[in-house]
């Protein structure tokens, strides 16, 4: 159980106060993370708090200004560059956010040397992407969908692509469905680790299906927003991988990696480049039908002027009880002989683990094992191997950092991170420098976060880099909520859950329960972090229970509970919801006559199928941005999970797991629908056709749709969404206002 | 047009070395791959290794690997041989060519070959 | 490394004739982008000239009668109608592996 300390004694009680939802939406309560830009093994740079940039030197404890914020106020800029050799920043502005991940910007070059902004050949604007060479100051760009090259900042561009075209061919930059999906990048380029070479994607969008949708703005008459968009079973974007020598980009132009003859057979996506030397490049591809992944290592051939991927350095992972991976399949971190590397998969108990691939997949060395799961390696150096995992305590919602230390025989382990702040911090990640000299952790919880800094050899705790004093301070004299998190064991289902309990909970009262779902395949919500947020007001203003509880479909407990799902979305995560709330009303302090249940996109879906499941638990809900069949979902996602839409594959499940399909058991509950009529993720499509199933079926229900809001709806629509949530919570559980 | 011009044959005694050049023109030297290959009388053709003038990168051939030494001069366009410890078999024709640009490990024009003969 | 076997290792015919020459190789010398095996003439004292490059490109300023093709480890040289000039020994050279490596020749004659 993890108590937060209420700090209320009957004395105080009279100087505490609840969270209101005004502290939510204004962000009074938010922390702040401490993540070093490295430069080198002792070095990195940070953002002060006055926006100059600081170079900061750990072992002379020397900090000096690089660049001064009236020059970065010059420009406008909100980010910045530095390139490798010291001589040059780059300084981003005019940010124009696109889709997840992707934005445009303008970019202005500074030459530290003689403190000036470059001119001539400056770059042209917007710039949809740009990064420096990992040595020197080569500058690589994507404009206008094609890849330019500077060898020097001043120096003339370089045009590497030519065919590139707005919605139709993508040069070094993702199109919608690999952003989102994918790559989860704004970037398809890849610099050699020495800058002699360049790979990147083209992707062709030529034959994929156009998303239309309507932005309404301010003119006489809306725009269009076209997007090519795949949806489960249509035709996906055509990938093929490039790499350049940008020292002589001229001599024999950008050569075509080839693709694995067993993937190259049917629909194939590439999903991951890793560079391992100058010569020497790493390619992971996926079967469309996403359960055979095979990692392809090339090499550079002087005397083709090209790359080599030879059979003998195909690996193939395979998965046969769901798709290969977790949400991703995992990338491999090389180790120094150029050709070995660490990787992780399932075992053979269906638990993801580091192994060690030096010859074949076949033949691999597990590193760790256990009835959890390794989810991240960070650092790989000649003696040891850093990563995260859940094993700590046998709590799958927590994160740890561990070394293991692979130049000793044999290797041991050693967790740096689970006595640190044990009470306070069980949620770790990390950065590391160059060579692991140094590395930076940052606890999310479930206490206040707290970033600090650590010497890579002897893990010792240098200084503290943020620590939230003034959020601390800010709270001392707030009533947050209770959190615990515990497990329910159902018919051999192990389900994790963390309830949020008023401050002064008495379990022989009755409380609301409002149950908060995402519940999509290989998510994780019962997590051991700090946040005050919705929810935590819900809790400690209006006096609801919240639960939060991973069901079937869910990561990092193992393959059998995360791959119960495969082809059948809807049906299990939904069941596990049910089942979680009423154990929860078995234990006495739920007034079952006032249960609710939120989500938003997966958990949309999943609220709305609960609400719909004839239960009757549920008095009602609300769906934020839901999903409400997948053959209105992206290829790349869905067809990880549910197969193709088609006869003789899955059609017949994606047919019966529809939202529409359950119009008429909406009858019996209070349904409040929201979306985005600017959606680029889940099309507004899904809602509209849920609000027509229902006006088909004569059920009444209530909506919201926020104009020209995208997924996240944000801004001033945040803070009108939130505020409409609990005014119909508040109704629903006939709580004052 | 593009032209290699090899040494003048040689006689050497068994143990000594001998060095053939060969001079290109009529391309960018550097920009490409000198091949040497070797042919004994009455016998095939043996690869024995290459220089990428413009990288230095070198590939030998394994049997040759200790004996066989390339370099390139790139101010007079001009890549060497150099063969150690010369056995009676080293008796051969030796070949430069030149690597094809597009042909991606064929050898596209050839030295006119200098005649080594070890003797003793 | 890759070994190269050249079939016949003498082919008598006349001139007008068609002639196929073979090559097989121990092991594939193709990839999905290209087959990596090229053929060269040698007359005597001469140094080799390339004919064709990757299987099957002609090389610029070699007659159109000569033609090559094959995939994987069977490779074929053919000389559509035989010139007196084109009796030489012909020789396949693979450059998928290193060590590159040449068959043994075959010998074209007059019969």
């Known amino acids: 159980i993890v108590l937060r300390p209420s700090r209320v004694h009957n004395s105080e009680e009279n100087t505490m106060r609840a969270l209101t939802l005004k502290d939510i939406l204004n962000g009074t309560f938010s922390y702040k993370t401490f993540f070093p830009n490295w430069i080198s093994g002792q070095e990195y740079l940070h953002q002060s708090a006055d926006n100059n940039i600081v170079l900061y030197n750990i072992e002379t404890g020397q900090s000096y200004t690089i660049l001064s914020n009236r020059t970065m106020k010059s420009v406008n800029a909100s980010n910045y560059g530095l390139s490798p050799d010291r001589q040059f920043v780059y300084l981003e502005s005019d940010y124009s956010k696109l889709w997840r991940y992707s934005y445009t910007a303008t970019y202005y070059i500074y030459d530290l040397s003689n403190g000036e902004f470059v001119r001539g050949n400056e770059l042209p604007r917007p710039i949809q992407y740009l990064c420096w060479s990992p040595v020197g100051s080569k500058l690589a760009y994507v404009y206008q969908n094609n890849i330019y090259l500077k060898q020097r900042p001043g120096d003339p561009p370089f045009q590497i692509t030519f065919n590139g075209r707005e919605n139709k061919i993508f040069n070094g930059i993702p199109d919608w469905v690999y952003e989102e999906e994918m790559l989860a990048t704004k970037y398809a380029l890849w610099w050699s680790p020495n800058g002699k070479f360049l790979a990147y994607a083209e992707f062709n969008d030529t034959d994929i299906p156009v998303i239309a949708y309507s932005y309404y703005g301010d003119e006489q008459y809306p725009r269009t927003i076209n997007i090519p968009y795949p949806k489960a079973g249509a035709k996906n974007p055509v990938v093929r991988i490039f790499i350049i020598d940008t020292t002589y980009p001229a001599y024999v132009g950008p050569q075509e990696v080839p693709v694995p003859a067993m993937i190259a057979s049917s629909d194939y996506y590439f999903s991951w480049l890793t560079w391992v030397t100058d010569e020497r490049v790493c390619l992971q591809w996926l079967k469309r039908v996403q359960n055979v992944s095979v990692l392809s290592i090339c090499d550079f051939r002087e005397d083709w002027q090209t790359w080599d991927c030879p059979k003998t350095q195909e690996h193939i992972e395979e998965s046969r009880t769901g798709w290969a991976g977790g949400f991703f399949v995992s990338t491999p971190v090389f180790s120094y002989d150029a050709i070995s590397y660490y990787k992780i998969f399932s075992d053979k108990d269906g638990y993801k683990h580091i192994h060690y691939i030096k010859d074949t997949v076949e033949n691999a060395i597990q590193i760790t094992s256990g009835k959890w799961e390794a989810i991240n390696i960070f650092r790989v150096t000649q003696d040891s191997l850093f990563y995260s995992s859940n094993e700590f305590e046998e709590y799958p919602g927590r994160r740890n950092i561990y070394r293991i230390s692979i130049g000793s025989y044999p290797p041991s382990k050693k967790c740096v991170t689970c006595h640190l702040r044990k009470e306070r911090c069980q949620y770790y990640t990390a950065s590391f420098s160059d060579y692991a000299k140094y590395y930076a952790l940052v606890c999310y919880g479930p206490g206040i976060p707290i970033s600090t800094l650590h010497d890579g050899r002897t893990d010792q705790e240098i200084k503290i880099l943020e620590e939230n004093k003034e959020l601390e301070n800010a709270l001392k004299n707030i009533q947050l909520p209770k959190e615990e998190i515990k497990k329910l064991e159902v018919d051999e289902i192990t389900l994790w859950y963390k309830m949020i309990l008023p401050p002064q909970f008495d379990r022989s009262k009755k409380y609301p329960l409002l149950i908060q779902v995402y519940g999509g395949p290989c998510s994780q919500s019962v997590r051991s972090v700090f946040a005050v947020n919705w929810i935590s007001y819900l809790a400690s203003k209006e006096g609801m229970v919240i639960a939060l509880v991973d069901g079937r479909g869910t990561a990092f407990q193992g393959d059998k509970l995360l791959y119960a799902v495969y082809r059948k979305l809807g049906v299990y995560e939904v069941e596990d919801q049910i089942t979680a709330v009423r154990k929860f009303i078995e234990m006495g302090f739920i007034d079952e006559k006032r249960i609710a249940i939120w989500g938003w996109s997966y958990g949309g879906y999943v609220s709305s199928l609960a609400l719909a499941s004839g239960t009757g638990l549920f008095k009602c809900g609300i769906a934020v941005a839901p999903v409400s069949s997948w053959e209105y979902y992206a290829s790349v996602y869905t067809e990880r999970f549910m197969g193709l839409p088609t006869k003789d594959d899955n059609l017949e499940h994606y047919k019966n797991s529809t939202v529409m399909a359950r119009a008429e058991y909406f009858r019996n509950v209070d349904y409040l629908l929201i979306h985005g009529t600017a959606d680029d993720n889940v099309h507004f499509q899904n809602s509209a056709q849920i609000a027509k199933a229902l006006v088909n079926a004569q059920v009444d229900f209530q909506a919201m749709w926020y104009s020209d809001q995208n997924h996240g709806l944000s801004g001033l629509s945040t803070n009108h969404l939130y505020t409409h949530m609990t005014h119909f919570l508040k109704q629903c559980f006939s709580l004052s206002d | 047009q593009v032209q290699l011009v090899q040494s003048g044959a040689e006689v050497k005694k068994p143990g000594a070395s001998v060095k053939v050049s060969c001079k290109a023109s009529?391309?960018?030297?550097?920009?490409?791959?000198i091949h040497w290959v070797r042919q004994a009388p009455g016998q095939g053709l043996e690869w024995m290794g290459w220089i990428h003038a413009g990288s230095g990168s070198i590939k030998y051939a394994q049997k040759l690997q200790g004996r066989v030494t390339m370099t390139t001069d790139t101010s007079t366009s001009t890549a060497y041989m150099e063969l150690r410890s010369l056995r009676s078999d080293d008796t051969a024709v030796y070949y430069c060519a030149r690597h094809g640009g597009t042909g991606r490990g064929a050898m596209d024009y050839w030295g006119q070959g200098t005649l080594v003969t070890v003797s003793s | 490394e890759i070994v190269l076997t050249q079939s016949p290792g003498t082919l008598s015919l006349s001139p007008g004739e068609r002639a196929t020459l073979s090559c097989r190789a121990s092991q594939s010398v193709s990839t999905s982008a290209y087959s990596y095996m090229h053929w060269y003439q040698q007359k005597p004292g001469q140094a080799p000239r390339l004919l064709i490059y990757?299987?099957?490109n002609l090389e610029s300023g070699i007659p159109d009668r000569f033609s090559g093709s094959g995939s994987g480890t069977d490779f074929t040289l053919t000389i559509s109608r035989l010139e007196p000039e084109d009796f030489a020994v012909y020789y396949c050279q693979q450059s998928r592996e290193l060590p590159y490596t040449f068959g043994q020749g075959t010998k074209l004659e007059i019969k």
């Open positions: 009529g391309y960018t030297f550097t920009e490409n791959i």
């Open positions: 990757l299987a099957s």
